[in-house]
């Protein structure tokens, strides 16, 4: 028969970062190639990446679509050489990937801090908000825009001439802390997702921007919310 | 000065759909705030049904949260409550409000700050 | 979900009294996302207090507020006439946001 020479796909994984989501697996293929399927518990199989000798596949156009939705695939192996019109009848060997649900899975990239502002002895922090592949009528939607107020800030902050670290919390993507007059100070940020109880609750930390540079007197403006 | 009015039917038959609408007038729902809606029981406390930001992101009380879609329409400035498969427990005044973004601890919080009157939602057949 | 508790049910007072009003978290909440609300017969909530401490635009400065971790306090120094009323705590921190049942402030 025409899959007698082919070995299933295994170790399935999905590797997924601010919903840009691509599945991968094994082995490497020998004179074989592999197609991916992909649906929603209750919907139909849609096959993506035909007859691909890579061991990955880029599922995002599929699951932005829903990003709270809860995902399977599954990866089919054909022998090199395949094509649909064959005739053969018998399934060819596959495998299953884990459950995947893009919202609560998704790991958090690395932000960016996008502007600081001393007036005085405050400073105006601002977290660059994070273009993704998830749209809304026709939009692409931010990060804030998909995970709300399920999407916090951590900043760490702290004299350039000392180590002491102080630590500030937002729900939106800005800050706004108190220094000490004539003192530069050096910040990073994380983004976390409080109600996450797993691994990928925060993001790693963002490059160190430190005042005195060019980032701090740029004035670039961001996403700015009305605060009271 | 943003304002909120809730509109929708005052009475709504058992094991029907609850739908309220809620108008922003003097600022617009796009503008980086959340949009709530509450409901007190007749002469009870208050109760968080749910909320929405202007992107569609929403976030539902899990009490309630198989019969309950929020939705938002930009282009009118307005957002809606839908609730399912209502009961005589359902009764209640309906509240929509705003949720904006106060500075506290070094940060941005958001709380209630701007409600509307209420309207007076009955489930009797 | 978080319960909050609030004490006593019914504070009965006279006009130029202090009224000191608690709020108890059956878990702790992070002083951020507690808030007081002032809710008068027929009408809408009206937000107080934001951040456990901090007033609101336009609220007089014998409305203040205290407290951290799972103990919370409303206190208005000199009741005045217009402060009989519900008073309700919230917070904002976990999903789903929740309500104290309410303290009724009553005139004496």
């Known amino acids: 028969s025409g899959t007698t020479n082919t070995v299933a796909a295994y170790n399935l994984t999905w590797k997924s970062t601010n919903f840009k989501t691509i599945l991968e697996w094994e082995p490497k293929p020998i004179n074989q190639v592999y197609t991916v399927q992909i649906s929603t518990k209750s919907g139909d199989w849609k096959s993506k990446c035909f007859y691909t000798a890579d061991t990955e596949c880029d599922l995002t156009d599929e699951i932005v679509k829903d990003v709270k939705q809860t995902y399977l695939a599954r990866v089919f192996s054909y022998p090199a050489g395949h094509v649909e019109s064959t005739g053969s009848t018998e399934e060819p060997p596959y495998e299953n990937s884990p459950e995947f649900t893009p919202y609560l899975e998704t790991n958090l990239g690395q932000p960016t801090i996008q502007s600081f502002e001393q007036v005085g002895t405050k400073v105006n922090v601002t977290v660059q908000d994070e273009w993704t592949l998830v749209r809304r009528n026709d939009t692409f939607l931010s990060l804030r825009d998909v995970f709300g107020k399920d999407l916090i800030y951590t900043l760490y902050y702290w004299k350039s001439s000392s180590s002491g670290k102080k630590t500030a919390k937002t729900n939106t993507n800005e800050f706004l802390i108190d220094v000490d007059k004539g003192e530069n100070y050096c910040f990073s940020v994380q983004a976390v997702i409080p109600s996450r109880r797993t691994a990928n609750r925060k993001s790693t930390d963002s490059p160190v921007e430190c005042m005195g540079h060019e980032k701090g007197e740029s004035r670039e403006t961001g996403h700015h919310h009305h605060h009271h | 000065q943003v304002q909120l009015q809730e509109s929708g039917p005052g009475l709504v038959k058992p094991s029907q759909t609850l739908s309220l609408t809620c108008t922003v007038s003097g600022g617009s729902i796009s503008s980086g705030q959340y949009w709530s809606w509450i409901r007190q029981h007749p002469g009870k406390g208050l109760e968080w049904i749910g909320e929405i930001y202007y992107s569609g992101s929403t976030r539902y009380n899990p009490s309630l949260k198989s019969r309950v879609t929020i939705s938002v329409d930009t282009s009118k400035n307005q957002f809606s409550l839908k609730l399912s498969s209502v009961t005589a427990a359902d009764t209640a005044v309906y509240y929509c409000?705003?949720?904006?973004?106060?500075?506290?601890?070094?940060?941005?919080?958001?709380?209630?700050?701007?409600w509307g009157k209420g309207t007076t939602v009955t489930v009797s057949s | 979900e978080i319960v909050l508790t609030q004490s006593p049910g019914t504070l009965s007072l006279s006009p130029g009294e202090r009224a000191t009003l608690s709020c108890r978290a059956s878990?702790?909440?992070?002083?951020?996302?507690l808030a007081w609300y002032q809710q008068k017969p027929g009408q809408a909530p009206r937000l107080l207090i934001y951040g456990a401490s901090s007033r609101a635009t336009g609220i007089p400065d014998r409305f203040s507020g205290s407290g951290s971790g799972t103990d919370f306090t409303l206190t208005i120094s000199r009741l005045e006439p217009e402060d009989f009323a519900v008073y309700y705590c919230?917070?904002?921190?976990?999903?789903?946001?929740?309500f104290g049942g309410g303290t009724k402030v009553e005139i004496k």
């Open positions: 878990q702790s909440v992070s002083s951020s996302y």
């Open positions: 409000a705003r949720d904006a973004p106060y500075y506290y601890g070094g940060g941005y919080y958001y709380y209630m700050d701007v």
């Open positions: 919230q917070q904002v921190g976990v999903v789903p946001y929740t």
